[in-house]
C-alpha cells in the first residue's frame, strides 16, 4: 500500500498521528471494529502530552480508548506494552467492579470526565477515539 502522509478529512493531526473523535456512542467492541474499518485503531495513549491532547478534544465525556483486559492481561490494541507504558488511572482504578449487576466485571478502559482512566463494562455505549499513524502503509493500492 501507499504511505499516508496527511490525515483524512475530518481527522485531526497531532505529532505524526491522526485522530478522529466520535460524537455518538458504541460498545467497546463496536468502537474497536469501527476504527479497524477505518484502517485505524482505538486511541493508544503513550505520553502525558498525548493524554492532554485527547482530553482537550473529548471534553468531560466518558470515551473509550484502546486498552482492555478481556483476554487476561491489560493490553493496548496496537501491541504497545501496558506494563512499561504510560498510565493515568483514576485513584482506586482499575477495580474490575462487579457491583453493577450486569454480569462479569469491568474489562475496558475509558477516559472519565476529568480525563483520568476507569475500567468499565465493555457493553456501555460510550464515545470513542480512533487513531492512525502517519507514514504507515495504508490499505489503498498505490496509484499507477
Amino acid at each position: 500500500g501507499s504511505e499516508r502522509t496527511c490525515c483524512p478529512v475530518n481527522w485531526v493531526e497531532h505529532e505524526r498521528s491522526c485522530y478522529w473523535f466520535s460524537r455518538s456512542g458504541k460498545a467497546w467492541a463496536d468502537a474497536d471494529n469501527y476504527c479497524r474499518l477505518e484502517d485505524a485503531h482505538l486511541v493508544v495513549v503513550t505520553s502525558w502530552e498525548e493524554q492532554k491532547f485527547v482530553q482537550h478534544h473529548i471534553g468531560p465525556v466518558n470515551t473509550w480508548m484502546g486498552l482492555h483486559d478481556q483476554n487476561g492481561p491489560w493490553k493496548w490494541v496496537d501491541g504497545t506494552d501496558y506494563e512499561t507504558g504510560f498510565k493515568n488511572w483514576r485513584p482506586e482504578q482499575p477495580d474490575d467492579w462487579y457491583g453493577h449487576g450486569l454480569g462479569g466485571g469491568e474489562d475496558c478502559a475509558h477516559f472519565t470526565d476529568d480525563g483520568r482512566w476507569n475500567d468499565d463494562v465493555c457493553q456501555r455505549p460510550y464515545r470513542w477515539v480512533c487513531e492512525t499513524e502517519l507514514d504507515k502503509a495504508s490499505q489503498e493500492p498505490p496509484l499507477l
Epitope: Q70, G72, W74, E92, Q93, P94, W97, Y98, G103, G105
Partner: antibody, heavy 115, light 107 residues
Framework: EVQLVESGGGLVKSGGSLRLSCAAS????????MNWVRQAPGKGLEWVSS????????DYADSVKGRFTISRDNAKNSLYLQMNSLRAEDTAVYYC????????WGQGTLVTVSS | DIQMTQSPSSLSASVGDRVTITCRAS??????LVWFQQKLGKAPKSLIY???SLQSGVPSRFSGSGSGTDFTLTISSLQPEDFATYYC?????????FGGGTKVEIK
C-alpha cells in the same frame, strides 16, 4: 513472565491462626483483582476470597466470612490471607490466582489443621 | 449463589476419542464461564475463557461452546497428556463458583 508464589502454609491446631502470603511478579500488580482459591485433599476447587486492585472491593465465601481476612500491599506486590479460628475443614492447598477467572495461579501452599 | 453442575463426574476414554464435558449453571451467566485442566499435584490451568475463547498456548483440539446456562468443553481427539480433571467456573457474579469436576481416565 507472570509469577505467583505462595508461602506461609503449615500445620496448625484447630482454633489457631496462620497468615498466607503470595508474592507476585511479571505484571502491574495494582491493576488486577486477586483471589485465594483452595482445594481440600481429594476434593474440588473452592473460591475463598477476592480483593480488587486498590482494596476497595473485598468478597468472601460464606464458609470463611468472619474468620479470614484478605489484604494486599501493592508497593510490595504481595497478597495476604489472614486465617483465624481455623477448623479441620480448612485443611487444603491454598492457591492465589489473578483475575476473576483465574488466568494465572501460584503453585499452592498446604495448610493442615489438626483437631 | 450460582450453582455449577458438571457432568459426567468421571469418564473413561481412549487416545483419539472425542470427549465432551458439560456444565450447567443454575441461572443465566451469559458467557462468563472458564474451563480448567488440573493434573495430579499441580495447580489448575485455564483452557477456555468467556465460554469459547482459547487461552494462549492451549492446543486447538480443545474448544468450548454455550451461553446462558448450558456449556460444553470438547476435546476433539484425546491425547495422552489430556488425562486429567476438568473444572468449569462461573465469573458472572460473586461468590465465584466451580463445577464439581470431571475426571478423564484412560480406558
Amino acid at each position: 513472565e507472570v509469577q505467583l508464589v505462595e508461602s506461609g502454609g503449615g500445620l496448625v491446631k484447630s482454633g489457631g491462626s496462620l497468615r498466607l502470603s503470595c508474592a507476585a511478579s511479571g505484571f502491574t500488580f495494582s491493576s488486577y483483582r486477586m483471589n485465594w482459591v483452595r482445594q481440600a485433599p481429594g476434593k474440588g476447587l473452592e473460591w475463598v476470597s477476592s480483593i480488587s486492585g486498590s482494596s476497595s472491593y473485598i468478597d468472601y465465601a460464606d464458609s470463611v466470612k468472619g474468620r479470614f481476612t484478605i489484604s494486599r500491599d501493592n508497593a510490595k506486590n504481595s497478597l495476604y490471607l489472614q486465617m483465624n479460628s481455623l477448623r479441620a475443614e480448612d485443611t487444603a492447598v491454598y492457591y492465589c490466582a489473578r483475575k476473576s477467572w483465574f488466568d494465572y495461579w501460584g503453585q499452592g501452599t498446604l495448610v493442615t489443621v489438626s483437631s | 449463589d450460582i450453582q455449577m453442575t458438571q457432568s459426567p463426574s468421571s469418564l473413561s476414554a481412549s487416545v483419539g476419542d472425542r470427549v465432551t464435558i458439560t456444565c450447567r449453571a443454575s441461572q443465566d451467566i451469559s458467557n462468563y464461564l472458564v474451563w480448567f485442566q488440573q493434573k495430579l499435584g499441580k495447580a489448575p490451568k485455564s483452557l477456555i475463557y468467556v465460554a469459547s475463547s482459547l487461552q494462549s498456548g492451549v492446543p486447538s483440539r480443545f474448544s468450548g461452546s454455550g451461553s446462558g446456562t448450558d456449556f460444553t468443553l470438547t476435546i476433539s481427539s484425546l491425547q495422552p497428556e489430556d488425562f486429567a480433571t476438568y473444572y468449569c467456573q462461573q465469573y458472572n457474579s460473586y461468590p465465584l463458583t466451580f463445577g464439581g469436576g470431571t475426571k478423564v481416565e484412560i480406558k
